[in-house]
């Protein structure tokens, strides 16, 4: 893996510092020729959190085109999921504008939606 | 330490403008939400606005939608509030106020010691 | 906008007893992604406020351990459990679950 990326199975990550709005996470992991995290696995969700720590965090799954979809084209539907209860849910109450397209880690390593342009945390994947 | 300094308050006609000032100092400013915060005299706290760390996003109370504008300097470490069309009700001491964590947190941690705008004639 | 309402609006305290206030919100504070968007805020005489709570629950570093914060959804209480009288001002609740952040109107703690 790059400097600074960490190997799991066939991928590297890495773990920002910093927090930006999901598309420009998503343009971030693009520019280091990676995207957004897709969780495949419950072992892979584990070591993600265990490097990401109890903070939110932007992972690779939209629904801002309609339904939910991976940034790298892996089935939805058919796939790994770990949403929190009720979630997710579309909340249109934030007062921000618009419901919620982008999923995050939570601090518990359940998922949300929230608004796409809060400045979480993120994590980029690449192939090995 | 965490410090904020607030200026450019006064007096002003209704209808008039004034700019408001934060001097942040003890953080790495580019690296926090901030927002401001009011309080008419013996009166309870007023949300005024929020600004994203890097400038990118700004949100507003609807009482001061199209009349307020918050904006940062990230290389002066310094936030605004241009404060135009000012009203009587628009009188208050204006605090601003540093989110508590980097990036997001939403609420404030740490708050300036506020800068009284009268608005009279 | 979410309202929230403190109970009660004044409250006169000897020192070393307990004191309560309580705090509802107009709506739910919880949030999708587990967390409370509830705060307490101190702002003693002349001064800005200060955080003493976040997340309903938690003490804000350096605030003593006689502040203590509870509750859930709508209905959130901050107790005093012996009141002392650098404890006097307005003690405020506020939401950041919506746009716009609300507070309450304030209960102002006074020592008898």
């Known amino acids: 893996c790059p400097v600074n990326w960490v190997g799991y199975e066939g991928s590297c990550y890495w773990f920002s510092r910093s927090g930006k709005p999901w598309p420009e996470a998503e343009k971030y992991c693009q520019l280091e020729n990676a995207h957004l995290v897709v969780v495949g696995s419950w072992e892979e969700q584990k070591f993600i959190q265990h490097h990401v720590g109890p903070v939110n965090s932007w992972i690779g799954l939209t629904d801002q085109s309609g339904p939910w979809k991976w940034v790298d084209g892996t089935d939805y539907e058919s796939g790994f999921k770990n949403w929190r209860p009720e979630q997710p849910d579309d909340w249109y109450g934030h007062g921000l504008g618009g419901g919620e397209d982008c999923a995050h880690f939570t601090e518990d390593g359940g998922w949300n939606d929230d608004i796409c342009q809060r400045p979480y945390r993120w994590v980029c994947e690449t192939q090995r | 330490q965490v410090q904020l300094v607030e200026s450019g308050g006064g007096v002003v006609q209704p209808g008039r403008s004034l700019r408001l000032s934060c001097a942040a100092s003890g953080f790495t400013f580019s690296s926090y939400g901030m927002h401001w915060v009011r309080q008419a005299p013996g009166k309870g706290l007023e949300w005024v606005a929020i600004i994203w760390y890097d400038g990118s996003y700004k949100y507003y109370a609807d009482s001061v939608k199209g009349r307020f504008t918050i904006s940062r300097d990230n290389s002066k470490n310094t936030l605004y509030l241009q404060m135009s069309s000012l009203r009587a009700e628009d009188t208050a001491v204006y605090y601003c106020?540093?989110?508590?964590?980097?990036?997001?947190?939403?609420?404030?941690?740490?708050w300036g010691q506020g800068a009284l705008v009268t608005v009279s004639s | 906008d979410i309202v929230m309402t403190q109970t009660p609006l004044s409250l006169s305290v000897t020192p070393g007893q307990p004191a309560s206030i309580s705090c509802k919100s107009s709506?739910?504070?919880?949030?999708?992604?587990?967390?409370?968007?509830l705060y307490w805020y101190l702002q003693k005489p002349g001064q800005p406020p200060q955080l003493l709570i976040y997340e309903v629950s938690n003490r804000f570093s350096g605030v003593p351990d006689r502040f203590s914060g509870s509750g859930s959804g709508t209905d959130f209480t901050l107790k005093i459990s012996r009141v002392e009288a650098e404890d006097v001002g307005i003690y405020y609740c506020?939401?950041?679950?919506?746009?716009?952040?609300?507070f309450g109107q304030g209960t102002r703690v006074e020592i008898k």
């Open positions: 106020a540093r989110d508590a964590h980097d990036f997001w947190s939403g609420y404030f941690a740490y």
């Open positions: 506020m939401q950041s679950i919506q746009i716009p952040w609300t």
């Open positions: 709506q739910s504070l919880l949030h999708g992604d587990g967390k409370t968007y």
